[in-house]
């Protein structure tokens, strides 16, 4: 989905006085797009500008992050009179121009996503050559992705007194809820640790103490799907050890 | 004016393979993508592969039907690519189009002529 | 696979309009963008590109070619039809690999 609140930015850098006064620099991209992992997204972005007919050299940037500042994902840059903006750089490969810039069209498309492509997003376009003249959105387009639940980790680690534990890692976004089932334990949420500073999709549920031998189920869920995984205990009884 | 030629078409035996070449000119051939499209006789279009440019690093999509069987490349000196297809099958027999898209765009702008393969023993 | 769907054959009188459609098994648009593209093929030669993303005509084409739709369901006009526009329509879709394309629309004169 796409919401329709626009942003117009209207931070103006170096206008010269080739300016005719109908246009001024704006940028209209919506606040969210929302994307599934693994599916492709739009990010859409238009410009007005006040150099009437400019067909001088420019460049379409986008960032990641935050503007003027944050980390190039894309840039192209069309030459004098061209219509071809000729990609310079497309990070991972994954980001392609859809507009054209020359009809004031910047929109990109972000192909193969990850939760990791869950960030803010800033378009930018600069003109060279007789004008010299830049914009950049200022509050940008949140690309939000959205994911089916995966678990990451699962495992079985050693506690003090000879007991043991079982963590399960998940990723989702939504985060997921993650529940443990295993021998006397019925269904228990099992001490869920908030998502990581960080790592905001990833979710953390602890067994703390096993106290049966058997098998222990992490199921993870969210309003896309659900996943889940399981760790085999067996104790050597009389001896310290266990194989998981 | 973008030409597209391909050539290496024929007869070939079931189980056999063949190389497809496509020379370009007329345009900046670093600049865009390349594929392949085959249409079998009085049939539809289907899409076979895309090589994708440097910037692009080059990557390769096939469609599932021909994965394995199938292997495209570039040569951005020579502004040609080719098609690798090996284990023919008689459902292979299609003439087979070179055509270019942009980088933004998985539309196909300009295509060859078109080169006949026919698979039959 | 997204699959297209377009009637067989049009007949379609010289100087009328001819609206052809193709429909798609899922949505083929993002955020506005629409990546469904049409294609016209004579006899003998190779497809030329008419349509790219849903409603730009291509460098060359004729005003009187024009695509509209959004989600799944998308139509090339012609208007008013001529006698060189005889020939068979495609769709193709881009919104997910492998890209496909419809079987063909074929115009013909009533």
């Known amino acids: 989905f796409v919401r329709t609140k626009i942003d117009t930015t209207e931070n103006l850098l170096n206008t010269e006085v080739h300016s005719s006064p109908a246009q001024r620099w704006s940028m209209q991209v919506p606040p969210e797009v929302s994307a599934e992992a693994g599916d492709a997204a739009v990010l859409p972005c238009t410009f007005t500008h006040p150099h009437r007919h400019y067909d001088g050299p420019l460049t379409a940037i986008w960032r990641a992050g935050e503007p003027y500042a944050g980390p190039q994902v894309f840039r192209c840059a069309a030459a004098r009179g061209s219509e071809l903006c000729q990609t310079a750089l497309s990070l991972h490969g994954r980001f392609r121009l859809l507009g054209n810039p020359r009809r004031n069209d910047l929109s990109l498309r972000v192909e193969r996503l990850a939760l990791a492509d869950d960030r803010r997003y800033f378009c930018r376009v600069e003109f060279a050559g007789d004008v010299h003249d830049r914009y950049e959105s200022r509050h940008g387009v949140r690309l939000h992705v959205t994911a089916a639940p995966r678990i990451v980790n699962i495992s079985v680690l050693p506690s003090p007194a000879h007991a043991f534990r079982a963590l399960c890692t998940a990723e989702g976004e939504p985060p997921p809820a993650l529940a443990w089932s295993g021998p006397a334990l019925g269904n228990s949420l099992a001490a869920v640790r908030s998502p990581r500073e960080g790592h905001g999709h990833l979710v953390t549920a602890e067994l703390p103490a096993l106290t049966h031998d058997g098998r222990y189920t992490c199921t993870a869920a969210n309003s896309l799907g659900r996943s889940e995984a399981s760790v085999y205990l067996f104790r050597f009884h009389g001896a310290s050890g266990a194989s998981t | 004016e973008v030409q597209i030629l391909e050539t290496g078409g024929g007869l070939v035996k079931p189980g056999g393979s063949l190389r497809l070449s496509c020379a370009t000119s007329g345009f900046n051939f670093n600049d865009y993508f390349m594929n392949w499209v085959r249409q079998a006789p009085e049939k539809g279009l289907e899409w076979v592969a895309q090589i994708r440019n440097k910037i692009y690093t080059y990557a390769t999509f096939y469609a599932e039907s021909l994965e394995g069987r199938v292997t495209i490349s570039r040569d951005d000196s020579e502004s040609s690519v080719y098609l690798q297809v090996s284990s023919l099958r008689a459902e292979d027999t299609a003439i087979y189009y070179c055509t270019r898209s942009l980088t933004g765009g998985d539309y196909f702008d300009y295509w060859g002529q078109g080169v006949m393969v026919t698979v039959s023993s | 696979d997204i699959v297209l769907t377009q009637s067989p054959a049009l007949a379609v009188s010289l100087g009328q309009r001819a609206t052809i459609s193709c429909r798609a098994s899922q949505s083929v648009t993002i955020s506005g963008y629409s990546f469904i593209h049409w294609y016209q093929q004579k006899p003998g030669q190779q497809p030329r590109l008419l349509i790219y993303r849903a409603s730009n005509l291509a460098s060359g084409i004729p005003a009187r070619f024009s695509g509209s739709g959004s989600g799944t369901d998308f139509t090339l006009t012609i208007n008013p039809v001529q006698a060189d526009d005889i020939a068979t329509y495609f769709c193709?879709?881009?919104?997910?690999?492998?890209?496909t394309f419809a079987g063909g629309t074929k115009l013909e004169l009533r």
């Open positions: 193709q879709q881009s919104r997910k690999s492998p890209w």
